[in-house]
C-alpha cells in the first residue's frame, strides 16, 4: 500500500576530521520508495563537480572536503561552522525532512587566555600554576609538561582543575620549568615556559641583602633579526648588566621598558618582562620606530632590589609590514575617489607619514604615483575618459613605502552615469575581474 | 537572528544569593563562550566571568571571584550566573553576552536589574 | 590589573564633523603572538552595549564606515568621520588581551 515518506535514520551533528570523508546518513521509509535530495543552509546541493558532495544509493552523503563556507545565519559566526545539513525524503504522496545537522571543523586558536606565570614557592607550602588555554571546538583539554615531558600527576599531590595545576605541597624536585599544553582535535598549543624555584623557607635577612645589591645596565643592543622567524621579525635586545653587592642574592632579574614620551610629558607606564639571564638576556616583542627606556630590577621570591640605571634605545622605523586595508575607489564628476584604512597598528613599524597611490598600466590612466601626505586615508584623481581606472596604495614611514594592497579597478561606463564597482556582491573588482569582464 | 534574554534578578539582602539566567537563541550555543557584564547605575561596564564553550574554563576578576559562579547548560542553551554573598557594591544591571572565540562580545542581552540593599 | 583611561570624558560635538576619543592602557595590550584585543563599544540611552569596533581597527558587521579605530602598544583611538545624531551615547574601550578584562570609564558624547 502507497504511503507517504517517513525519516527513519536523522543525520546527527558532526565534526569533519579529514582526511577522509565525512559521511551523513538519512533513511526514509515510504511506497513507492522516496527519493532523497540533500541540502545545506537551505540550498539544495547540485552533486555536479567541482561540488565536494556525493549521493550514495541509500541516501549518505559523502563529504569529500569541507564546503566553502555560505552566509552565516548567526550574525559574526565562528570559523568552525560549515552549515547545516537536511535531508528531504519525497514520493507522490509528500515530503518529509529531516532534522538539521550541523557540520563543524575543528578549530584551536593560538592565543591563551591566561599564560602560567614564573614563580618562586616555599617548601611545604602549596602553589598553583594557572593556565587559561585558547578556545578551540572541541573544546581543548590541559596537559601538564615538567622540564619538557608530560608530568606524572601524583594523586593527592597534584590536581588539575579548569586548566590550572594545583600542587599541594612543594618539593625540592618541584623546581623547573612547566608549561601547559591545550590539545583537541585541530592539533595542539604550547604556553610559554614558566619556571617554578622552590626555596627553603625563609629567614628574614634576604630582602635586607637584596637592598644592598647594586645594578649596572651596561649595555643595550638591537639583536639581528633571526631568519627562521620569517621576513618581518619583531625587534628584540640584548641587555647585559653587572651587580655588585652581597654575593648574588638575587634569584631573577626583570627588564621594565617602556616608549620614551616627548620631554615634559607623562611618562608611559613602564612594561616588566622576567629574563632569562644572570647578567645579559634577549628582550623581543618591541616596535620598529619607536624610542626606549629600559632598567633592570633584582627579585627574589616576593622582595625587590633598587632598579638600574636607565639606557634608551632608537628602534630604527621599518617600511611597513602590511598593506593600507578597504582600498575602495568611487566615481565623483569627472574625479575617481581612492579612499583607504591604514594597516593594523602592529604593522606600522614606524610612523606613517603618509601614503603613495599608483594608477597601473594599461588603463585609463598612464602610469602615475601620487604622495598623499600626513593622515589623510583618500585621494581625489581626475578622469577624462571612460574606461577602467585601477590603483594600489601603500602606506610610506620614514623608511620608505611598504607593501602596496591588491590592486583595485573601477570600470567608467560611456556616458559616466554608471559605475561599475561591486560585481554582484563580491567586492571591489579586482585586476583579473577586470580582464576577464573587458574581454567577455 | 541572535536574542539572548537575561532574567532572574530583583531585590536581595547583603549577604544573600541569586541565580542569573540567560536563554540564548539563534545561533550554535555549544560552540560560543559567553560572559557576564555589569553596570552599577551611572558606572563603567564590568566585566564579571566568562565561560568556555564546553563549560570546562572560567575566568573572574579579584572582586567577584569565590562568590560568584558562572555556569552553561548546552543543551538547555542557557547560561547562568550563581552570585552568592551579596554586598550593597554588587548592585547592578547585569547583562549576558557572546563571545567570538575570547576576542570580543558581539552582541549582547538587554540585562537585569540586581539590587543589594536592606 | 591593566587599567584603562579614556579622553574627553565627555565630547560634545557638532552634527557633521568628526569626533575623536582616546583610549590609554597602563600596559601594553599587544600579547605575545602579537595580537591586540582591544574593542569599541557604544551604549545609547536605555540600551546595552553595541560592539563598534573589534581588535583595534576591524569594524563589526552593519557599523557604519564613518567609524574606524586605530592604535597600537597602549595608545588606541576611535574616530567619528562625521557625527550623526544617532551616535550620540556613551563609548567605551575594553580589553581582552590580560584577564581581567577591563572596561575604560566611558566618553559621553552629545550634540552641541
Known amino acids: 500500500q502507497d504511503s507517504p515518506p517517513q525519516i527513519l535514520v536523522h543525520p546527527q551533528d558532526q565534526l569533519f576530521q579529514g582526511p577522509g570523508p565525512a559521511r551523513m546518513s538519512c533513511q526514509a521509509s515510504g511506497q513507492p520508495p522516496p527519493t532523497i535530495r540533500w541540502l545545506l543552509n537551505g540550498q539544495p546541493l547540485s552533486m555536479v563537480p567541482p561540488d565536494p558532495h556525493h549521493l550514495l544509493p541509500d541516501g549518505t552523503l559523502l563529504l569529500l572536503q569541507p564546503p566553502a563556507r555560505g552566509h552565516a545565519h548567526d550574525g559574526q559566526a565562528l570559523s568552525t561552522d560549515l552549515g547545516v545539513y537536511t535531508c528531504e525524503a519525497s514520493n507522490r504522496l509528500g515530503t518529509a525532512v529531516s532534522r538539521g545537522a550541523r557540520l563543524s571543523v575543528a578549530v584551536l586558536r593560538e592565543d591563551f587566555q591566561i599564560q602560567p606565570r614564573d614563580m618562586v614557592a616555599v617548601v611545604g607550602e602549596q602553589f598553583t600554576l594557572e593556565c587559561g588555554p585558547p578556545w578551540g571546538h572541541p573544546e581543548p583539554t590541559v596537559s601538564w609538561w615538567k622540564d619538557g615531558k608530560p608530568l606524572a600527576l601524583q594523586p593527592g599531590r597534584h590536581t588539575v582543575s579548569g586548566g590550572s595545576l594545583l600542587m599541594a605541597r612543594a618539593e625540592k624536585s618541584d623546581e623547573g620549568t612547566y608549561m601547559c599544553v591545550a590539545t583537541n582535535s585541530a592539533g595542539h598549543r604550547e604556553s610559554r615556559a614558566a619556571r617554578v624555584s622552590i626555596q627553603e623557607p625563609q629567614d628574614y635577612t634576604e630582602p635586607v641583602e637584596l637592598l644592598a645589591v647594586r645594578i649596572q645596565l651596561e649595555n643595550v643592543t638591537l639583536l639581528n633579526p633571526d631568519p627562521a622567524e620569517g621576513p618581518k621579525p619583531r625587534p628584540a635586545v640584548w641587555l647585559s648588566w653587572k651587580v655588585s653587592g652581597p654575593a648574588a642574592p638575587a634569584q631573577s632579574y626583570t627588564a621594565l621598558f617602556r616608549t620614551q614620551t616627548a620631554p615634559g610629558g607623562q611618562g608611559a607606564p613602564w612594561a616588566e618582562e622576567l629574563l632569562a639571564g644572570w647578567q645579559s638576556a634577549e628582550l623581543g616583542g618591541l616596535h620598529w620606530g619607536q624610542d626606549y627606556e629600559f632598567k633592570v630590577r633584582p627579585s627574589s621570591g616576593r622582595a625587590r632590589g633598587p632598579d638600574s640605571n636607565v639606557l634608551l634605545l632608537r628602534l630604527p622605523e621599518k617600511v611597513p609590514s602590511a598593506p593600507p586595508q578597504e582600498v575602495t575607489l568611487k566615481p565623483g564628476n569627472g574625479t575617481v575617489f581612492v579612499s583607504w584604512v591604514p594597516p593594523p597598528a602592529e604593522n606600522h613599524n614606524g610612523i606613517i607619514r603618509g601614503y603613495q597611490v599608483w594608477s597601473l598600466g594599461n588603463t585609463s590612466l598612464p602610469p602615475a604615483n601620487w604622495t598623499v601626505v600626513g593622515e589623510q586615508t583618500q585621494l581625489e584623481i581626475a578622469t577624462h575618459m571612460p574606461g577602467s581606472y585601477c590603483v594600489q596604495v601603500a602606506a610610506v614611514t620614514g623608511a620608505g613605502a611598504g607593501e602596496p594592497s591588491r590592486p583595485v579597478c573601477l570600470l567608467l561606463e560611456q556616458a559616466m552615469e554608471r559605475a561599475t564597482q561591486e560585481p554582484s556582491e563580491h567586492g571591489p573588482w579586482t585586476l583579473e575581474q577586470l580582464r576577464a569582464t573587458l574581454k567577455r | 537572528e541572535v536574542q539572548l534574554v537575561e532574567s532572574g534578578g530583583g531585590l536581595v539582602q547583603p549577604g544573600g544569593s541569586l541565580r542569573l539566567s540567560c536563554a540564548a537563541s539563534?545561533?550554535?550555543?555549544?560552540?560560543?563562550?559567553m560572559s557576564w557584564v555589569r553596570q552599577a547605575p551611572g558606572k563603567r561596564l564590568e566585566w564579571v566571568a566568562t565561560?568556555?564553550?564546553?563549560?570546562?574554563?572560567?575566568y573572574y576578576p579579584d572582586s567577584v571571584k569565590g562568590r560568584f559562579t558562572i555556569s552553561r547548560d548546552n543543551a538547555k542553551n542557557t547560561l547562568y550566573l550563581q552570585m552568592n554573598s551579596l554586598r550593597a557594591e554588587d548592585t547592578a544591571v547585569y547583562y549576558c553576552?557572546?563571545?567570538?572565540?575570547?576576542?570580543?562580545?558581539?552582541?549582547w542581552g538587554q540585562g537585569t536589574l540586581v539590587t543589594v540593599s536592606s | 590589573d591593566i587599567v584603562m583611561t579614556q579622553s574627553p570624558l565627555s565630547l560634545p560635538v557638532t552634527l557633521g564633523e568628526p569626533a575623536s576619543i582616546s583610549c590609554r592602557s597602563s600596559?601594553?595590550?599587544?600579547?605575545?603572538?602579537?595580537?591586540?584585543?582591544l574593542n569599541w563599544y557604544l551604549q545609547k540611552p536605555g540600551q546595552s552595549p553595541q560592539l563598534l569596533i573589534y581588535r583595534v581597527s576591524n569594524r563589526f558587521s552593519g557599523v557604519p564606515d564613518r567609524f574606524s579605530g586605530s592604535g597600537s602598544g597602549t595608545d588606541f583611538t576611535l574616530k567619528i568621520s562625521r557625527v550623526e545624531a544617532e551616535d550620540v551615547g556613551v563609548y567605551y574601550c575594553?580589553?581582552?588581551?590580560?584577564?581581567?578584562?577591563?572596561f575604560g570609564p566611558g566618553t559621553k558624547v552629545d550634540i552641541k
Open positions: 553576552a557572546r563571545l567570538i572565540y575570547y576576542d570580543y562580545l558581539d552582541y
Open positions: 539563534g545561533f550554535t550555543f555549544s560552540t560560543y563562550a
Open positions: 565561560i568556555s564553550n564546553g563549560g570546562t574554563y572560567t
Open positions: 575594553l580589553q581582552v588581551t590580560h584577564v581581567p578584562w577591563t
Open positions: 600596559q601594553s595590550l599587544e600579547n605575545s603572538n602579537g595580537n591586540t584585543y
